[in-house]
Interface confidence: low
């Protein structure tokens, strides 16, 4: 079980929001918070260990997912083309 | 990591280059293809993944395709060749953890002249 | 389309001396970019991947740095066998921007 700790979102960049969120996770061992269908979730650790976030399904239904070429997080296409880029620090 | 097939060609003719390597496996790691024209910078052509997948430079999308032959082989298509594509083309093995090619093979020619 | 603007285009340096050679892109590429020198009929070969990650027997005098859309190769007292021409090759996602590569900085030696 997952919830949303912290969300800020800042919407000062013209064509661009950038939203900053922290969730608490309560998960089995073995597995870690992650992102699964846009929403928090537990995910298996060696998705996180190997950083092959896409495993993770962390896009909605029928968005297309590719990992950041220095492995720092993902991006999400929607079917119109619009991109969502997601970081984890 | 070694390519050949590079020739002269005739403007229109299609070409296809072979990248050959020995010491590690196509089903583990990224292959890109980089083109170079006679004393100028390099170009990013496309890569494909362990998986199959690939991906391309918008100026290559259509004219330019790779594919994966063996575990050890891997293709460059190209099709209506014109004098613009003439260089020496790069095979590089790409790492997977970033966009850092580690390991190139020498080169091969394309002329295209008529 | 991503565009990396490369700067200088050629620079002529002292034995000793600390270079630097700047790589701006368009947009953010996460620290997407990696360094290379090559010289004459020879391929590149590669100094620097993810921004500032030194390739393993690559001399220490090469360093890497930035973040965002702004990045620098440092070449920290600049030696003979450093004349060569340096790109830089930055993108963050092969499905949107793909890689592309600057126009290159040809570094001499006096």
């Known amino acids: 079980t997952c919830e949303i700790v912290t969300l800020d979102r800042d919407s000062s960049q013209p064509r661009r929001t950038i939203a900053r969120q922290t969730a608490r996770c309560a998960c089995r061992k073995g597995q870690i918070a992650g992102t699964t269908r846009a929403r928090p979730a537990c995910v298996d650790a060696r998705i996180i260990k190997t950083k092959q976030w896409c495993d993770m399904l962390p896009c909605l239904e029928g968005e297309g997912c590719d990992l950041l070429i220095n492995r720092s997080g993902w991006t999400c296409t929607q079917p119109g083309g619009r991109i969502k880029t997601t970081t984890v620090s | 990591v070694e390519e050949s097939g590079g020739r002269l060609v005739t403007p229109g003719t299609p070409l296809t280059l072979t990248c050959t390597v020995s010491g590690f496996s196509l089903s583990s790691d990224y292959m890109s293809w980089v083109r170079q024209a006679p004393g100028e910078g390099l170009e990013w052509i496309g890569i494909i993944y362990p998986s199959t997948t690939t991906y391309y430079a918008s100026w290559a999308k259509g004219r330019f395709t790779i594919s994966k032959t063996s575990s050890t082989t891997v293709e460059l298509k190209m099709t209506s060749l014109t004098t613009e594509d003439t260089a020496t083309y790069f095979c590089?093995?790409?790492?997977?953890?970033?966009?850092?090619?580690?390991?190139w093979g020498p080169g091969t020619l394309v002329t295209v002249s008529s | 389309e991503l565009v990396m603007t490369q700067t200088p285009p050629s620079l002529s340096a002292s034995v000793g001396e600390t270079v630097r050679i700047r790589c701006l892109a368009s947009?953010?590429?996460?620290?997407?970019i990696s360094w290379y020198q090559q010289k004459p009929e020879k391929p590149p070969t590669l100094l620097i991947s993810g921004a500032s990650n030194l390739e393993s027997g690559v001399p220490p005098r090469f360093s890497g740095s930035g973040s965002g859309t702004d990045y620098t190769l440092t070449i920290g007292g600049v030696q003979a066998e450093d004349a060569a021409t340096y790109y830089c090759?930055?993108?963050?996602?092969?499905?949107?921007?793909?890689?592309?590569f600057g126009a290159g900085t040809n570094v001499e030696i006096k």
């Open positions: 947009e953010d590429i996460y620290s997407g």
């Open positions: 090759l930055g993108g963050y996602s092969y499905s949107s921007t793909g890689l592309t």
């Open positions: 590089a093995r790409g790492s997977n953890w970033s966009s850092g090619m580690n390991l």
